[in-house]
């Protein structure tokens, strides 16, 4: 007649700083009342009390005030525990004891995790490098948990396991900073990449460094891209320009062209084996096939989204190899601001009013300026908030609190810093008493 208590078999994985639910359930008999229930959560190893419910009442958290039950669900047999703002130190086993007439218990494991940052790479020495020099490449990634796995490889995918030293240090919160050092002898040129994996989240963070010693290989392909970022409006098409100079007798069969995201190395589009291999990027990219033979390797990106913003690398390989990166800056114009007033009727000089200026669906974040009817800037008592929607576009709400004079005009200017596009709205408050908006 022991009470059956059920918990998940697999550990509960929780990110540091988030809330975790440790599930625990029992099957209440007909006529069961909470007055009969004794529920205790405790740390399995130390038996430290975490949370309890007894004598028909939640006895509260005994664990740094970060735990809670689900009181409305207890009567249905849900004895789960909510653990707030998870810390590394919370990792371990928690036991759920349930006693009604009979008694049962089960333990659930909490596995804490935190993603590692994108690795930063440093080189020592970092100038006047020549083939044959020994260099030390350091790959650093921060604030992850648990300890990371680190892998190195060269530009051909060959694993580099010799001459690697990896150290991991925990900070006060128990999060690890990982530093992995690779010592290599330089060839004519080389790419070295470091991959830091969080084994619990199966999350990979990687970076690479390409070292071209001073005596660069002869005849490398010169790849040209615009220096300035390409600015594209959300929803429109953008052309990322890239060109090379084909030699006499050049044929497309010799060309390997790869576009990829500079940071993640994600393939975007490729042309190999004499043909367009198509888009690997949500089917929104295209080359200019008729212009490739003339050295035009540009990429067309259709229906641009905020998430496309960043650096794209154009790799061109014929006999030799060259690459260059072009930045895409995404933008969206802000709508004409709408103005609201609170309170909006029976206004008199001396009243304090709140004027809200709202402008929608712009990118990137806006700059907001207020001024009065004489062009005098109003900077005190302004609060501006910007919220991104699912598409990454921002809605901006700016609130100005002012004391009314006999009459006054208040204008709000919303600027898109990339497009240098200004959208403005104004409100004029006159008369006494006043009503806003004016009645017909």
């Amino acid at each position: 007649g022991a009470l059956e208590v059920q918990v998940p078999e697999d550990p509960v994985v929780a990110l540091v700083g988030t809330d975790a639910t440790l599930c625990c359930s029992f099957s209440p008999e007909p006529g069961f009342s909470l007055a009969q229930l004794n529920l205790i959560w405790q740390l399995t190893d130390t038996k430290q009390l975490v949370h309890s419910f007894a004598e028909g009442q939640d006895q509260g958290s005994a664990y740094a005030n970060r735990t809670a039950l689900f009181p409305d669900l207890l009567a249905q047999g849900n004895a789960s525990l909510r653990l707030q703002r998870v810390r590394v130190a919370d990792e371990g086993s928690f036991t759920c004891f349930v006693s009604i007439r009979d008694f049962g218990s089960a333990a659930v494991s909490l596995q804490v995790a935190a993603p590692y940052s994108k690795p930063s790479m440093t080189l020592e020495p970092n100038k006047d490098l020549r083939p044959g020099d020994t260099v030390t490449i350091t790959c650093s990634s921060y604030q992850g948990y648990p300890e990371a796995e680190v892998f190195w490889q060269d530009g051909q995918g060959v694993p580099l396991t010799g001459n690697v030293t990896t150290s991991q240090m925990a900070n006060e919160q128990g999060l690890f900073d990982v530093h992995s050092i690779l010592r290599v002898v330089l060839g004519a040129n080389g790419t070295y990449s470091c991959l830091v994996r969080n084994p619990v989240l199966q999350q990979d963070a990687h970076s690479s460094v390409t070292i071209t010693p001073q005596r660069s290989p002869t005849g490398a392909v010169e790849v040209q891209v615009p220096e300035d970022p390409v600015v594209a409006l959300v929803g429109t098409d953008a052309t990322l320009r890239c060109s090379f100079s084909p030699e006499p007798g050049f044929s497309l069969a010799q060309l390997n062209l790869i576009w990829q995201l500079t940071d993640t190395k994600q393939l975007v589009h490729s042309f190999t084996e004499g043909r367009d291999q198509g888009s690997a990027y949500a089917n929104r990219t295209a080359l200019f096939p008729d212009l490739l033979a003339q050295g035009n390797a540009s990429l067309r990106l259709q229906r641009v989204r905020v998430a496309d913003e960043g650096s794209f690398t154009c790799f061109v390989s014929i006999r030799d190899f060259g690459s260059a990166a072009v930045s895409l800056q995404v933008a969206a114009p802000y709508s004409k601001p709408s103005m609201t007033l609170e309170p909006n009727k029976d206004l008199r000089p001396g009243d304090t009013v709140t004027i809200t200026c709202s402008s929608y669906r712009g990118y990137p974040e806006a700059e907001v300026f207020w001024q009065d009817g004489q062009g005098v800037p109003l900077t005190g008592n302004v609060t501006t908030s910007q919220m991104a929607n699912e598409q990454g576009l921002f809605d901006v709400h700016s609130v100005l609190r002012v004391v009314l004079g006999a009459n006054g005009t208040y204008s709000c200017l919303v600027r898109n810093p990339v497009l240098q596009q200004d959208a403005h709205g104004s409100v004029t408050i006159t008369g006494q008493p006043m009503t806003f908006p004016p009645e017909a």
Epitope: Q156, G157, V158, P159, H206, K265
Partner: antibody, heavy 121, light 106 residues
């Protein structure tokens, strides 16, 4: 079209050597490593080693160390695998394969058609 | 040396059935690749960098990872999937393959 074309079948006596060729076309031969993988009858795939045709760096599986030699001729875009001191258990299909991709995603994207080597007295 | 152990060695399955093949690594690998081989043919790239389908591979194939276990799943087996599947790693020397899993259609 990217292709690796291997030389034809060979029948060899125990104790002798065999040299298999693998001619690459349709891509820059020096940009990717060439690996050799063998498969005994009814068995799985077994890695033998690789060569970087550009630097001519090689690395061999312990099992074949001292018995296998990998070479590459840039002028003809051809890789070679020579296996010496042949014994009957070396009877297998020998494949060359290109290890391709971009950092850090690499895999064997193109394989030769295979060369059958039979070792028999 | 990282040893890759595939299970099962052999599986006989009816069409439309869900199939799983597990490749267990003796220690962590950076990426796992999978190849398909049919009788008297060279191996073909099937899945690269753990979970990316190679060109032309149907979407019924997928891979999930738990610790050092990489599991290849075929959601609804078709006759053309009858083949031997190999996993492969090169996170550290030597490069190694799993022993292979042969899928046969009942």
């Amino acid at each position: 079209e990217v292709q690796l074309v291997q030389s034809g079948a060979e029948v060899k006596k125990p104790g002798s050597s065999v040299k298999v060729s693998c001619k690459a076309s349709g891509y820059s031969f020096t940009s990717y490593t060439i690996h050799w993988v063998r498969q005994a009858p009814g068995q799985g795939l077994e890695w033998m080693g690789y060569i970087n045709p550009n630097s001519r760096n090689t690395d061999y599986a312990q099992k074949f160390q001292g018995r296998v030699t990998l070479t590459a001729d840039k002028s003809t875009s051809t890789a070679y695998m020579e296996l010496s001191s042949l014994r009957s258990e070396d009877t297998a299909v020998y494949y060359c394969a290109r290890y391709s991709g971009s950092t850090p995603y690499w895999y064997f994207d193109v394989w030769g058609q295979g060369t059958t080597v039979t070792v028999s007295s | 040396e990282i040893v890759l152990t595939q299970s099962p060695d052999f599986q006989s399955v009816t069409p439309k059935e869900k199939v799983t093949i597990t490749c267990r690594a003796s220690s962590s690998v950076s990426y796992m690749n999978w190849y398909q081989q049919k009788p008297d043919q060279s191996p073909k790239p099937w899945i690269y960098a753990t979970s990316n389908l190679a060109s032309g591979v149907p979407s019924r194939f997928s891979v999930s990872v738990s610790g050092t276990d990489h599991t290849l799943t075929i959601n609804s087996l078709e006759a053309e999937d009858a083949a031997t599947y190999y996993c492969q790693q090169w996170s550290s020397n030597p490069l190694t393959f799993g022993q292979g899993t042969k899928l046969e259609i009942k």
